[in-house]
């Protein structure tokens, strides 16, 4: 289709080479009252109804995205050619940063409902650059945490080094929805609820003598509980003795509950005590078996190919640790009688 009638928007993505970050493009198709470029300008006034209702902002889940190759080749369907770009309704998600994402992206409705809708499309010229200087040492992260039940704030990474007074007007979106009243470089959240978790986008306009473009950053906001004040507790094994059959294989499971920590480095390991000696056992990797907002249950098994007489004289110890402290639970094997 002819893209010369598309409205054009220029966007800049300056990504940090130090962190993982995502980016999004919204299919900003015009609403009915802004639909002056959603129909062919060549039509005579007699042929053009006074109001040309475009498909309307409620129908934007069904749009098609293309990339325009720089060599002038035909438009490419995003879904077929770019695995690191995902379409979700009318939003295009870039999962990995890189200058190779620079280019022109076009979106238009899949269903052309009338001949006037043919040129109803938006062309987004995206320029992607790595952040060059570390002029702002403490710029806000693209991953921000909000503590449930307390007051918090969400900062626009590309503007977090500017004071509120010198900051330009910012446009914020939450999960693709415009937050019309939020206009500063920082959103204050009076009281944090689960509701506040999501993908936030902040845009501001930057201009030079030649043109202006939208600088965009994406912030993933997570709502969290406060760091635990407790050391982990061992849920299993509960008993300190275990009846076993000699010569048979045996798996002993250690399950421990770790309270939430923002910087989470759980330790769960097995070691063996034999008289005065003790050594750590090489066992399968630990696995998370349940994760909630407040805590996580992690399991790690010790596997004996067959229980020997020597194993009955040993203690098998599960050791778990977080930043607060550690807990141990030892198990003595006992031969089954009868």
């Amino acid at each position: 289709f002819n893209i010369s009638g598309c409205s054009t928007k220029k966007l800049l993505w300056t990504y940090s080479t130090r962190s993982e970050e995502e980016f999004v493009l919204f299919c900003d198709l015009p609403e009915p009252q802004k639909s002056h470029f959603c129909h062919r300008n060549r039509l005579s006034p007699k042929q053009v109804p006074e109001h040309l209702p475009f498909m309307g902002s409620n129908d934007l889940s069904d749009v098609q995205w293309y990339q325009q190759p720089s060599n002038g080749d035909p438009l490419e369907d995003i879904r077929k050619s770019y695995p690191h770009i995902i379409q979700d309704k009318c939003t295009l998600h870039f999962l990995t940063p890189g200058v190779n994402n620079s280019g022109s992206y076009i979106c238009r409705p899949k269903m052309i409902k009338s001949p006037y809708d043919v040129a109803c499309c938006v062309k987004m010229i995206l320029e992607v650059k790595p952040q060059t200087n570390a002029s702002c040492e403490y710029s806000a992260s693209h991953k921000q945490d909000l503590l449930l039940g307390s007051t918090g704030s969400i900062s626009c990474p590309s503007l977090s080094c500017q004071s509120d007074a010198q900051s330009p007007a910012v446009t914020w979106y939450k999960n693709g929805k415009l937050l019309s009243v939020e206009r500063s470089n920082r959103i204050v959240v009076d009281e944090v609820y689960d509701y506040h978790q999501g993908t936030y986008v902040c845009d501001y306009t930057q201009s030079d003598t030649v043109s202006s473009w939208t600088v965009r950053a994406v912030v993933q906001v997570r709502t969290i509980v406060g760091d635990t004040k407790l050391k982990p507790d061992i849920l299993d094994p509960v008993e300190d003795t275990l009846e076993v059959e000699l010569g048979k294989p045996l798996t002993i499971s250690c399950k421990a509950r770790f309270g939430f920590e923002r910087v989470f480095n759980p330790v769960i390991k097995w070691y063996i005590k034999d008289s005065d000696l003790e050594w750590e056992v090489s066992v399968p990797e630990a696995k998370s078996i349940k994760s909630t907002l407040k805590d996580e249950i992690i399991e790690r098994n010790i596997i004996l190919e067959k229980v020997t007489q020597r194993d009955l004289r040993r203690k098998f110890v599960c050791f778990v640790q977080n930043s607060i402290g550690n807990t141990t639970q030892s198990v003595q094997l006992k031969e089954k009688r009868g």
């Epitope: 959103i187 009281e191 609820y193």
Partner: antibody, heavy 121, light 111 residues
Framework: EVQLEESGGDLVQPGGSLRLSCAAS?????????MCWVRQAPGKGLEWVAC?????????YYASWAKGRFTISRDNSKNTLYLQMNSLRAEDTAVYFC????????????WGQGTLVTVSS | DIQMTQSPSSLSASVGDRVTITCQAS??????LAWYQQKPGQAPKLLIY???TLASGVPSRFSGSGSGTDFTLTISSLQPEDFATYYC?????????????FGGGTKVVIK
């Protein structure tokens, strides 16, 4: 008993100023409530004026028409909400209600009985 | 500011009638909408919050529905004590649950 009681309503000349108070009892201001002012002109509908968050952020929110002329504030130690009204006009004549907004629902679950402000020469 | 548009501005009905009042927000407010009832000389009383949750002590003949920009308050069988003025209100402001703009009100009068 949990209640809100407004005071300070009066007859004032156009261009004048007035400060309304709202005393809360039976609950603590420092809890996570939005304390707000709503007004109702004689025979007209409800009109939101302003809110202040009683928690730590102390954020304030105003209807666009109220910005600049009206100032909402609070004194947590006195459990009292205030509305400072400057450059008053005839169209500010109304019953001013104090109301409490609750948590994550944002609705007004507690209202005062209102205080009448009359702006007239 | 968000604008809330309520219709009709008044309606006349009889006891036992089913009454429907609509409210439209100027932008998407998800389900952050409350409905109030006000009688002459009294402060408003909360009926419904979060678009469809009945406030404590409110009779089940009152119900609310809708999300996004379009909302409805329904009284399934009008009772004599229901003749009053009803208001909708937006209860989200940006990302905060701040009670703010009201609709213009709907006066329910006896036919």
């Amino acid at each position: 008993e949990v209640q809100l009681e407004e005071s300070g309503g009066d007859l004032v000349q156009p261009g004048g100023s007035l400060r309304l108070s709202c005393a809360a009892s039976g609950f603590s201001f420092s809890s996570s409530y939005y304390m707000c002012w709503v007004r109702q002109a004689p025979g007209k509908g409800l009109e939101w004026v302003a809110c202040i968050y009683a928690g730590s952020s102390g954020s304030t929110y105003y209807a666009s028409w109220a910005k600049g002329r009206f100032t909402i504030s609070r004194d947590n130690s006195k459990n009292t909400l205030y509305l400072q009204m400057n450059s008053l006009r005839a169209e500010d004549t109304a019953v001013y209600f104090c109301a409490r907004g609750a948590g994550s629902n944002g609705d007004f679950n507690l209202w005062g009985q209102g205080t009448l402000v009359t702006v007239s020469s | 500011d968000i604008q809330m548009t309520q219709s009709p501005s008044s309606l006349s009905a009889s006891v036992g009638d089913r009454v429907t009042i609509t409210c439209q927000a100027s932008e998407d407010i998800e389900s952050y909408l409350a409905w109030y009832q006000q009688k002459p000389g009294q402060a408003p009383k909360l009926l419904i919050y979060r678009a469809s949750t009945l406030a404590s002590g409110v009779p089940s003949r009152f119900s609310g529905s809708g999300s996004g920009t379009d909302f409805t308050l329904t009284i399934s069988s009008l009772q004599p004590e229901d003749f009053a003025t009803y208001y909708c209100q937006c209860t989200i402001y940006g990302v905060n649950f701040v009670p703010n703009a009201f609709g213009g009100g709907t006066k329910v009068v006896i036919k």
